[in-house]
Amino acid sequence: MMTGTIETTGNISAEKGGSIILQCHLSSTTAQVTQVNWEQQDQLLAICNADLGWHISPSFKDRVAPGPGLGLTLQSLTVNDTGEYFCIYHTYPDGTYTGRIFLEVLESSVAEHGARFQIP
């Protein structure tokens, strides 16, 4: 039975040209995390594999940085980066857990950031 839950940064906003950290955390399970995939709508952004480390999709290499931890840092944000992001945790033996983050990139310099999520 899958007992785990994913906590995420939830709905967040950031300024155009700035950067943001997307972070998820899997809790309440002893399952081993074998891989985390990060997706933006229907695009694979990056993968963090327990054995192979990080792979950043070539088309995002200039603007996506791995980490911190299993999270993902998006840089040089544009309004087109607004949308849904998913962290997909592949675990053994539980299976797959998915978390959702909604990012809004604002033109204004008064973007309100959601509470900064930190992994203890």
Epitope: T34, Q35, N37, E39, D42, Q43, L44, I47, N49, D51, L52, H55, S57, S59, H90, Y92, P93
Partner: antibody, heavy 118, light 107 residues
């Protein structure tokens, strides 16, 4: 240089068994998921089975479930496919292949031919 | 299981032609779509992974696009060594499934 070398193919009667091996070199075998993919003569590609890096998680095509078993020995850098209760429709070239990140298959062996016939 | 439908099943083209092969999934597979090239008697070769990423060492005349259910492999200027069979493959979920293949022949 990544190399995958299959062996163990041959002619076997229906109902018989074969064990295919794939010797891997040129990369850290224990870090990669591995696959078996087959191709019947003149036909397309069909995924058969896969196994995660640690060997803990395995998955199979419905057509071989209960008859084929995928396994690996990371200390020997070798992938195996134990094939039991073979049928004529299992006749194919069997390829061993490497699957980084479980998203794509980047290297394939040269294949070994399995012929099931009486 | 996710069905992958490739079209056309075969095509005739000349050196220098622009060639487009399409692949449709029976359900959304995000960008978990790969393209392979296979020549007679040889193992398949990875061309494009994750829908649009060019595998190292593959010529830039090959490109991939699409997401969700509809995907395209484009060869911008067909070369003599490109005459082969091309397969799409989804890795969104097991069982992994391949398209039926597209044979690119010399006109």
């Amino acid at each position: 240089e990544v190399q995958l070398l299959e062996s163990g193919g041959g002619l076997v009667q229906p109902g018989g068994s074969l064990r295919l091996s794939c010797a891997a070199s040129g990369f850290t075998f224990s870090s990669y998921s591995m696959h078996w993919v087959r191709q019947a003569p003149g036909k397309g590609l069909e995924w058969v089975a896969s196994i995660k890096s640690s060997g803990g998680y395995k998955s199979y095509a419905d057509s071989v479930k209960g008859r084929f078993t995928i396994s690996r020995d990371n200390s020997k850098n070798t992938l195996y496919l134990q094939m039991n209760s073979l049928r004529a429709e299992d006749t194919a070239v069997y390829y061993c292949a490497r699957g980084p990140y479980d998203v794509w298959i980047d290297y394939w062996g040269q294949g070994t031919l399995v012929t099931v016939s009486s | 299981d996710i069905q992958m439908t490739q079209s056309p099943s075969s095509l005739s083209a000349s050196v220098g032609d622009r060639v487009t092969i399409t692949c449709r999934a029976s359900q959304s597979i995000s960008s978990y779509l790969n393209w392979y090239q296979q020549k007679p008697g040889k193992a398949p070769k990875l061309l494009i992974y994750a829908a649009s990423s060019l595998q190292s060492g593959v010529p830039s005349r090959f490109s991939g696009s699409g997401s969700g259910t509809d995907f395209t492999l484009t060869i911008s200027s067909l070369q003599p060594e490109d005459f082969a069979t091309y397969y799409c493959q989804q890795s969104y979920s097991t069982p992994l499934t391949f398209g039926g293949g597209t044979k690119v022949e010399i006109k």
